[in-house]
Interface confidence: low
């Protein structure tokens, strides 16, 4: 028996369901009584789900997994993983035994989009050209780690005096805080872009500093 899986990682959003595809080619006359199917974590061999002795043995993974029982006899051994968590990320092995056996691994990449950045300014009043100001761009609840880019009003990248920190919360999602220190000109716009490298999702935030009080562009 030959097992086939997707070579590309499966990308799943946190709290959505994911399907880890696995298939085999049953011989003529194949019955489910012959099938021994095991899904396990590749690194640790922890059991995730199994089908043995002609029946679905159920989830060994917090009751969040399921097979496609009506499709098994056709050779579809895919696994449904419900309510995906960051901690589900990794490699899963599909093991199929009928008379001989084969196995293959499929990677699950978990992702979560970053929120629209919030911008803060320090100090935020009595600003004059030549003042040093600190602009903080904060974006929340994303995964995996973000890439952060700063630009000025002309679209010129700002790379000096930027400090970015990323902290994982209890769910493993990252909160991103990027700090830009700049010397004010007469006026100017500063924008940050928080990019999720897996989703290719960009979240934008910007702040405009003029001779008048600080203004934020309206929410899109």
């Amino acid at each position: 028996v030959e097992v086939q899986v997707s070579e590309d990682p499966v990308v799943a959003l946190v709290d959505t369901d994911a399907t880890l595809r696995c298939s085999f080619s049953p011989e003529p006359g194949f019955s489910l009584a012959q099938l021994n199917l095991i899904w396990q974590l590749t690194d640790t061999k922890q059991l995730v789900h199994s089908f043995t002795e002609g029946r679905d043995q159920g989830s060994a993974y917090s009751n969040r997994t399921a097979l496609f029982p009506d499709l098994l006899v056709q050779g579809n051994a895919s696994l449904r993983l419900q309510r995906v968590r960051v901690t589900d990320e990794g490699s899963y092995t599909c093991f199929v035994s009928i008379q001989d056996f084969d196995s293959a691994a499929v990677s699950l990449q978990v992702a979560a989009p970053y929120s629209k950045p919030s911008m803060t300014l320090e100090p935020n009043k009595d600003l004059r050209p030549g003042n040093m100001v600190t602009i903080t761009c904060s974006s929340y609840q994303g995964y995996p780690e973000a890439e952060v880019f700063w630009k000025d009003g002309q679209g010129v990248p700002l790379t000096g005096n930027v400090t970015t920190s990323q902290m994982a919360n209890e769910r493993g999602l990252f909160d991103v805080h990027s700090v830009l220190r700049v010397v004010l000109g007469a006026n100017g716009t500063y924008s940050c872009l928080v990019r999720n490298p897996v989703l290719q999702q960009d979240a934008h935030g910007s702040v405009t500093i003029t001779g008048q009080p600080l203004t934020f562009p309206p929410e899109a």
């Epitope: 990682p9 974590l41 690194d43 640790t44 922890q46 059991l47 989830s59 060994a60 993974y61 917090s62 968590r85 960051v86 901690t87 589900d88 990320e89 990794g90 490699s91 990677s107 990449q109 493993g172």
Partner: antibody, heavy 119, light 113 residues
Framework: EVKLQESGPGLVKPSQSLSLTCTVT?????????WNWIRQFPGNILEWMGY???????SYNPSLQSRISVTRDTSKNQFFLQLNSVTTEDTATYYC????????????WGAGTTVTVSS | DIVLTQSPSSLAMTVGQKVTMSCKSS????????????LAWYQQKPGQSPKLLVY???TRESGVPDRFIGSGSGTDFTLTISSVQAEDLADYFC?????????FGGGTKLEIK
């Protein structure tokens, strides 16, 4: 706030069994994560002993496989370590520890309990 | 089993100095599927439990000061304290979280002069 608290006898005789309890508060051990036992020998060497996952499956260090059992009581939100046929070499501080899912790094540690094996 | 070797076994530094300590693995800890290195660093102050500082070789745990910097890939890893403080007096351990059995290095003891 998550807390892990080890308890059990501080003195065990050679050839007997060592039994420890970890009581978890602030988080259900059936919700997520792996719940581990790690010990630290005199001289500060750390050894991972094994875990029981939130789904109830266990994995052990092969060096202890024949002597170790990690079980749990979900109604009390506790998990347990049993180590059989102890020798003086099992004298150590024993920690119960939570690891983030399958990532196997250790984010929450109990305070530890010292067990001396001596006759 | 994966063996982790830490060096030096001890070092004494003065407040404000930069500290580097090494952890070498007997096997590659880089997971090619996600390009992450499965190595963690812990700090253990006298009389306390170990505390997670860094995982995946360079990701700082929440609340850890940014003077603690993890780096490296494959088999060679480094923990740097950019400007050591008196409260950093502790033992530091590396741990591979690549595969079971999970293993730790022998530790580096940091003393403050």
């Amino acid at each position: 706030e998550v807390k892990l608290q080890e308890s059990g006898p501080g003195l065990v005789k050679p050839s007997q069994s060592l039994s420890l309890t970890c009581t978890v508060t602030g988080y259900s051990i059936t919700s997520d994560y792996a719940w581990n036992w790690i010990r630290q020998f005199p001289g500060n060497i750390l050894e991972w002993m094994g875990y029981i996952s939130y789904s109830g499956s266990a994995s052990y260090n092969p060096s202890l496989q024949s002597r170790i059992s990690v079980t749990r009581d979900t109604s009390k939100n506790q998990f347990f370590l049993q180590l059989n046929s102890v020798t003086t070499e099992d004298t150590a501080t024993y920690y119960c520890v939570r690891s983030l899912g399958r990532r196997w790094y250790f984010g929450f540690w109990g305070a530890g309990t010292t067990v001396t094996v001596s006759s | 089993d994966i063996v982790l070797t830490q060096s030096p076994s001890s070092l004494a530094m003065t407040v404000g100095q930069k500290v580097t300590m090494s952890c070498k693995s007997s096997q590659n800890l880089l997971n090619s599927s996600n390009q992450k290195n499965y190595l963690a660093w812990y700090q253990q102050k006298p009389g306390q439990s170990p505390k997670l500082l860094v995982y995946f070789a360079s990701t700082r745990e929440s609340g850890v000061p940014d003077r603690f910097i993890g780096s490296g890939s494959g088999t060679d890893f480094t923990l740097t304290i950019s400007s050591v403080q008196a409260e950093d007096l502790a033992d530091y351990f590396c741990q591979q979280h690549y595969s079971t059995p999970l293993t730790f290095g022998g530790g580096t003891k940091l003393e403050i002069k």
